[in-house]
C-alpha cells in the first residue's frame, strides 16, 4: 500500500518526513535515496563498495556491502545499534554501568571541588560536585549513552525524551538559532518582564520577553519550585534580577519568575555557609557570613507549550534542575551567575518567611 501521509511512511530514526506534491518523502541524508532512504542512487543490486561510499554507518560503525537493499550492512561500535548505528543501544543491566575507574574519587566526592578525573557517570559526576549537586542528571534516562551525546550538537532521537533532558534541545532546534541573537540580548535583558511586549524578544531563546506578550494566556506552571543557590548576595542579585531571569529563561527555553511570598516579596534569601552539627564555641560567636542567595523560582510553560514544537517543556522543577546540572557537568552552562547548587522542591503554599 502506497503511503499517503507522513503518518503512514516509516522514515529511519532521525530522518524527518516531508509532505511533497508527489506524496510523503523521507528527507534522506546525503548518499541515500528512495521513499524510505533505503537505497543508494545509481547502485544496482549487489553493487560492490559503492554502497559504502556514502559512509552510511554512524558513530564509528564500519560498513560492508550487502547483496540486498539497502546494499550495505553496518557493524556498529559498542553502545550503538540500528541499521545505520543511529541509536544508542538499550541500557544494559546496572552491573554493566562503567564503574568509577579511580579509587581516589571516593574520597573526593562532595568536597566542593569538581575533579576532572572524577567527572563521569561511573563516579557520579564527582558525587555531584560537577553537576551542581543534582547527582546524576541522567538517572532517569534509559538510553545509556545519552550523557555522551548531550553536547554533540546533533539530534540523537533516542535521547530526545524529557528523562534524557531533550538531548540538549538538539532535535528541537532544527537549524534555528540556539541562543538569543547577540544584537537583541542586552536589549531583551533590559526589557525583560517590564510590562511591554517586545516581539523581537518574544522567542524561547530570548526568554519569551518575560511573558510581556502573553498577558492574555493563562499561566501553566510546572510542578514544584526551582531552588538555586547563587554565590552572590541578595542585594547584588536583585539589582540584576531582570538579566538573571532572562538568561535563565533563555537557557531553559521557558519562562521563569521569582516565587513571591504572602507579602508579594520575591523569595530570595541570604545564604549562609551551612555549619556542621558539632560546632566549637568560637565558631558560634562568628557573625554568619552571607556568601550567596537562595532563590526560589517558578517555571511558567504557557508559551513553551503553545509553541509549534511543544514537546520540550520541563514538566517539573526537578527536570529543569537536572538539565542545569547536566550543562554544568559537561561544562556548557553559559550563565554569568555562579551557581553553588540547584534542586527542584515540591510546591507548598507560600509562607511569609521560609526557614532554610
Amino acid at each position: 500500500r502506497v503511503a499517503r501521509s507522513c503518518r503512514e511512511l516509516q522514515c529511519p530514526v532521525g530522518v524527518p518526513c516531508q509532505q511533497t506534491p508527489r506524496g510523503p518523502r523521507c528527507a534522506c541524508p546525503p548518499g541515500l535515496s528512495g521513499p524510505s532512504c533505503r537505497s543508494f542512487p545509481g547502485s544496482p543490486p549487489g553493487a560492490s563498495n559503492a554502497s559504502c561510499a556514502a559512509a552510511p554507518c554512524l558513530h564509528g560503525g564500519s560498513c560492508r556491502p550487502a547483496p540486498l537493499a539497502p546494499f550495505f550492512r553496518c557493524a556498529c561500535a559498542q553502545g550503538w545499534t540500528g541499521p545505520r548505528c543511529e541509536a544508542p543501544a538499550a541500557a544494559p543491566e546496572v552491573s554493566e554501568e562503567p564503574r568509577c575507574p579511580r579509587a581516589a574519587c571516593q574520597a573526593k566526592r562532595g568536597d566542593q571541588r569538581c575533579d576532572r578525573e572524577c567527572n563521569s557517570p561511573g563516579c557520579g559526576w564527582d558525587g555531584g560536585d560537577c553537576s551542581l549537586s543534582v547527582g546524576d542528571p541522567w538517572r532517569q534516562c534509559e538510553a545509556l549513552q545519552c550523557w555522551r551525546l548531550f553536547n554533540n550538537s546533533r539530534c540523537d532521537p533516542a535521547c530526545s525524551s524529557p528523562a534524557c533532558l531533550y538531548d540538549n534541545f538538539d532535535c528541537h532546534a532544527g537549524g534555528r538559532e540556539r541562543t538569543c541573537n547577540p544584537v537583541y540580548e542586552k536589549y531583551c535583558a533590559d526589557h525583560f518582564a517590564d510590562g511591554r511586549c517586545d516581539q523581537g524578544c518574544n522567542t524561547e531563546e530570548c526568554g519569551w520577553d518575560g511573558l510581556d506578550c502573553a498577558s492574555e494566556v493563562p499561566a501553566l506552571l510546572a510542578r514544584g519550585v526551582l531552588v538555586l543557590t547563587v554565590l552572590l548576595p541578595p542585594e547584588e542579585l536583585l539589582r540584576s534580577s531582570a538579566d538573571f531571569l532572562q538568561r535563565l529563561s533563555a537557557i531553559l527555553r521557558t519562562s521563569l519568575r521569582f516565587r513571591l511570598d504572602a507579602h508579594g516579596q520575591a523569595m530570595v534569601f541570604p545564604y549562609h555557609r551551612p555549619s556542621p552539627g558539632s560546632e566549637p564555641r568560637a565558631r558560634r560567636e562568628l557573625a554568619p557570613e552571607v556568601i550567596g542567595s537562595v532563590v526560589m523560582l517558578e517555571i511558567d510553560n504557557r508559551l513553551c507549550l503553545q509553541s509549534p514544537e511543544n514537546d520540550h517543556c520541563f514538566p517539573d522543577a526537578q527536570s529543569a534542575a537536572d538539565y542545569l546540572g547536566a550543562l554544568s557537568a559537561v561544562e556548557r552552562l553559559d550563565f554569568p551567575y555562579p551557581l553553588r547548587d540547584v534542586r527542584g522542591e515540591p510546591l507548598e503554599p507560600p509562607e511569609p518567611s521560609v526557614p532554610l
Partner: antibody, heavy 119, light 107 residues
C-alpha cells in the same frame, strides 16, 4: 573579619627543608579550602596546591608534587606548607589564600612568606 | 593542562585612558575566570570573579567579560591607583592556573 597571617621570612640552605604556617581567623576554618601560591621575583603567580581542612584532602599542581607537603591543624586553625630539597629555584614569596566555595576564586590572601635559598 | 595566556604582557597608558587586557584559555573554561590586581610588595587583590562579577568594594570602572576561551578585563577610565600588574586565573577545575600577567605602566 577574615584574616590569614603567615609566618616570617626564612633563609635556608640548598637541600634543606622549610615549613611555613598560615593562621586563619574570622571564619570557620574547616569550611574553606586553603590554597598556596608561589611568586618568584618579578614573575607571575603559580598555583601550588590546596588542602581541605575538613577532610585533609589535597589537590596539587603536578609541578609541585613531591616538593610541597600540605597539612592543617584544626585545633589552631592553621595550615602548613613544607617545601623539601630546596634549590635556588624555590626562592620566592609564598602566599596562602582562602579558596571560595566550589569555584576557588581567592578573595582573601595572607601577606606572604619570603623564602630565600642560599648557601 | 589548560594554559592561560595574557596579552599584552605590558602596556603604557595615561590617566583617563580606557585599558583592555585579554586572557585566552587553551580550552573552553565557560565563565570560570577571575581577575586580580597586584601592586609591588603586596598580595594580589580580587577584582572580578566568574568572568563578569565585580568583587565587593571594587570600583565600577573595572569590568570583566567573555565566555569559553576569550576573556577581557576593561578599566573604563584609568586612575593613578590603577597602575599595577593584572592577572587572570582559571577557576572551578584544578589546576587553578594563572596567566602570565599584564603590567600597566604610566605613559
Amino acid at each position: 573579619q577574615v584574616k590569614l597571617l603567615q609566618s616570617g621570612a626564612a633563609l635556608v640552605k640548598p637541600g634543606a627543608s622549610v615549613k611555613m604556617s598560615c593562621k586563619a581567623s574570622g571564619y570557620a576554618f574547616t569550611d574553606y579550602w586553603v590554597t598556596w601560591v608561589k611568586q618568584s621575583h618579578g614573575k607571575s603567580l603559580e598555583w601550588i596546591g590546596e588542602i581541605s581542612p575538613n577532610s585533609g584532602g589535597t589537590n596539587f599542581n603536578e609541578k609541585f608534587k613531591g616538593k610541597a607537603t600540605l597539612t592543617v591543624d584544626k585545633s589552631t586553625s592553621t595550615a602548613y606548607m613544607e617545601l623539601s630539597r630546596l634549590t635556588s629555584e624555590d626562592s620566592a614569596i609564598y602566599y596562602c589564600t582562602r579558596g571560595e566555595i566550589r569555584y576557588n576564586w581567592f578573595a582573601y590572601w595572607g601577606q606572604g612568606t619570603l623564602v630565600t635559598v642560599s648557601s | 593542562d589548560i594554559q592561560m595566556t595574557q596579552s599584552p604582557s605590558s602596556l603604557s597608558a595615561s590617566v583617563g585612558d580606557r585599558v583592555t587586557i585579554t586572557c585566552k584559555a587553551s580550552q573552553n573554561v565557560g565563565n570560570n575566570i577571575a581577575w586580580y590586581q597586584q601592586k609591588p610588595g603586596k598580595a594580589p587583590k580580587l577584582l572580578i570573579y566568574y568572568a563578569s562579577n565585580r568583587y565587593t568594594g571594587v570600583p565600577s570602572r573595572f569590568s570583566g567579560s567573555g565566555y569559553g576561551t576569550d576573556f577581557t578585563l576593561t578599566i573604563s577610565s584609568l586612575q593613578p591607583e590603577d597602575f599595577a600588574t593584572y592577572y587572570c586565573q582559571r577557576l572551578y577545575n584544578s589546576p587553578f592556573t594563572f596567566g602570565g600577567g599584564t603590567k600597566v605602566e604610566i605613559k
